[in-house]
Amino acid sequence: QESLSCDASGVCDGRSRSFTSIPSGLTAAMKSLDLSFNKITYIGHGDLRACANLQVLILKSSRINTIEGDAFYSLGSLEHLDLSDNHLSSLSSSWFGPLSSLKYLNLMGNPYQTLGVTSLFPNLTNLQTLRIGNVETFSEIRRIDFAGLTSLNELEIKALSLRNYQSQSLKSIRDIHHLTLHLSESAFLLEIFADILSSVRYLELRDTNLARFQFSPLPVDEVSSPMKKLAFRGSVLTDESFNELLKLLRYILELSEVEFDDCTLNGLGDFNPSESDVVSELGKVETVTIRRLHIPQFYLFYDLSTVYSLLEKVKRITVENSKVFLVPCSFSQHLKSLEFLDLSENLMVEEYLKNSACKGAWPSLQTLVLSQNHLRSMQKTGEILLTLKNLTSLDISRNTFHPMPDSCQWPEKMRFLNLSSTGIRVVKTCIPQTLEVLDVSNNNLDSFSLFLPRLQELYISRNKLKTLPDASLFPVLLVMKIRENAVSTFSKDQLGSFPKLETLEAGDNHFVCSCELLSFTMETPALAQILVDWPDSYLCDSPPRLHGHRLQDARPSVLECHQ
């Protein structure tokens, strides 16, 4: 049987060692013990007795089916306990009695049906994170389950087979920063929502089929809900259930962020928010994020005109990887407060972008992200976006552009341009001189000779440059990142000619460890203040004798350097 490996600070790793029991030889010097992915099955009375100073105990996926009642009696210092993904079919309050310092407890993925006969957690007054439940058997949430817990940073409940929710079960926890609920159906959603309204600041709903969700007024007094963020992940919605969900917003007037990740909309976007007061109650929502939205009939999707007014005050919208090919002009014009728009990984082409960025579109927009779409012409893209008078940042990375022309037009306030991973081979004066930040990393550039008088940051890593660009091109440059090119050397003169340079990241290049370079690095200890990842990423490529040595450690031969 393999043994534990422990470092000097008492962190012990025993993962995947085929242990069939808690190993012997544990000591009070141990601060952290990870025995995940073993075959331990049983934790008995004295197995952990010696670990009086243990702060972290991780027993994930170790086939544990039995824990004696006082197995943790000596672990008064324990702060982190992970018992997830084991075979515990019932839970005992006696395990947790001694764990008064516990801050993190993960009981998820064990085959229990309830959290036990009595309250499990009354002594865990320092608990901050609690994860409970499982996919198949956890079926009941009761009023006693959370007794003694008054405040949690994170509570995650996996209850995909929930058959009974006892009213007010979650109400006893007065403050929950982030509640994650895995519910397969919406049957108990309204009841739970009523109980958490006055305690939860961020509610995340996972894997829930909301297709049949129907709103009914909540049995709550006037509450000032602290909820600021609402997220749906892996949920299924219809046009009708979306309308019903909107009605919940009247209870969470401070909501500022809504997120939909990996959701499916079985509908056509034919939303009809029936209650006019919903519109005003969306007033505080500033951020809407949609990622990987699957719309089976996306080719029949409506123009969303019914929700235009809902989004007039929204400041940040992300719709990523969701087959967006057009934001209708009239919709863009309604997004009057929009400052940030991210349409990454979609199907935008210049022809439709022109309609989206029509006259009067997105009048407050400052940042536009069109990364990984189907744009081809940099010139056309710049021209189309001239309507965006307040645009300062544009990310058009990961589009495959045709070679850039000599001149282009861009929005006049533009200061930031991301052209990384666009396949460009040459930079030309198409790039605007107003830029303060330019990212051209991961391209095919073998030189850079463009004068950019205001440029403060240049990102040009993962290209084919053999030397640092000429400093006279960037009189006010503060940051240059030029990793993973073919730069063979840099000198005192070169670095000295960048009058304002504060940060240079030039690791993982092909350095020729000449006498000059090595002398310079030896004589200039201040390099460590400018060079990011110095000295570990700065290695000699040649001569062969020094290949793989760090520049800092390499020593030229006296013979070579005094010829």
Partner: nanobody, 127 residues
């Protein structure tokens, strides 16, 4: 009805060895935790050792550490206690115990943990 029958006790010289056996019958013991306790005349019953159903986890009381070894033969539903370097203070009646229930809210060093008990076998160590 579950029955536990101990055997292997007897008289032994100081420094000698004995192997106690505990045979279980009348039920499936594949998931049982087996334990050994002892009781000297005029004293309380004392925990000696226990072993889990698969033999994966063993635990010893202070008196047994380093000298006694608990093992089990799952096929024969039998538990064993090999006792080496016996001393006169090891003289006692040795009891076998078994826990059948799956829920563990108490400790295996306590008598209340176990559901079934044998009648005991006498061990006498002479000087």
């Amino acid at each position: 009805e579950v029955q536990l029958v101990e055997s292997g006790g007897g008289l032994v010289q100081t420094g000698g060895s004995l192997r106690l056996s505990c045979a279980a019958s009348g039920s499936t013991f594949s998931k049982a935790v087996m334990g050994w306790f002892r009781q000297a005349p005029g004293k309380e019953r004392e925990f000696v050792a226990r072993i889990t159903w698969n033999g994966g986890s063993t635990y010893y009381g202070d008196s047994a550490k380093g000298r006694f070894t608990i093992s089990r033969d799952i096929g024969k539903t039998t538990a064993y206690l090999l006792m080496n370097s016996l001393q006169p203070e090891d003289t006692a009646n040795y009891f076998c115990a078994a826990r059948m229930r799956p829920v563990f809210s108490s400790s295996s060093v306590q008598e209340s943990f176990y559901d079934y008990w044998g009648q005991g076998t006498q061990v006498t160590v002479s000087s």
